[in-house]
């Protein structure tokens, strides 16, 4: 999916209202400087296809991140704020089938959800230079 | 077996207003996404509200501030009451109800037409 079309002020606010709390909520007792961030993101679209890519993809050590809450959110978010989302996604999950997940905590969750607070934080500075 | 049940569809003018319901049963999930879609003849299927497990609510810019979604988990049903309706409100409802995450919207009402037109 393009994330070119987006609404990204919407989605911006989405999140600085409540996905960010959700994050804070999944990574408490855990310090900030725990993890170092090496994913990066070069534009708006950029960092929702990697926000996309990390939240829904499970990973070798990390299978369970899109049952959390604020998976929900970023997912009903993408959705409502970019344009045709809603039906490549329905087109791709009639075509696959149906995983159900438990939902574990494990370190590379807390890794992979502290590498997602920094996509979202340089999502929400687009005007920032890339260091 | 899992099924979504959704009513309250109609014909109204518009300005009046109508209360969608959908009844979920089979699920037992404490984690969800309960959303309302929409389909206009020739177009795609929209989301236009969403409301989580946690009580915290999406709505879409065209119906904000005119439709108000809610749930009631003890009776496993979700609301859509939409005010102020116009004839661009025209369209089937769907609700629909992600559950675990996996995938997108695991489970899908019927729908329900909504037509507004005087």
């Known amino acids: 999916y393009d994330f070119t079309n987006c609404d990204f002020e919407k989605i911006k606010a989405a999140y600085l209202s409540t996905i960010s709390k959700d994050l804070i909520t999944y990574m408490s007792g855990t310090k900030s400087t725990e993890f170092n961030n090496t994913v990066s993101c070069s534009n708006r679209p950029h960092c929702l296809t990697e926000i996309q890519s990390l939240t829904f993809n499970p990973t070798a050590g990390c299978a369970s991140l899109a049952k959390e809450m604020f998976a929900m959110k970023t997912k009903a978010a993408l959705a409502i704020w970019c344009p045709g989302y809603s039906e490549t996604q329905i087109n791709a999950t009639q075509a696959m089938k149906k995983r159900r997940k438990r939902k574990v905590t494990t370190n590379k969750c807390l890794e992979q959800v502290s590498q997602l607070q920094g996509l979202w934080r340089r999502f929400n500075r687009p005007l920032l230079k890339q260091q | 077996e899992v099924q979504l049940v959704e009513s309250g569809g109609g014909l109204v003018q518009p300005g009046g207003s109508l209360r969608l319901s959908c009844a979920a049963s089979g699920l037992t999930f404490s984690s969800y996404i309960m959303g309302w879609f929409r389909q206009a003849p020739g177009k795609e299927r929209e989301l236009v509200s969403a409301i989580f497990s946690d009580g915290s609510t999406l709505y879409a810019d065209s119906v904000k501030g005119r439709f108000t979604i809610s749930a009631d988990n003890s009776k496993n049903t979700a609301y859509l009451q939409m005010n102020s309706l116009k004839p661009e409100d025209t369209a089937v409802y769907y609700c629909?109800?992600?559950?675990?995450?996996?995938?997108?919207?695991?489970?899908w009402g019927q729908g329900t037409l909504v037509t507004v037109s005087s």
């Open positions: 629909a109800r992600d559950d675990y995450g996996g995938n997108f919207f695991d489970y």
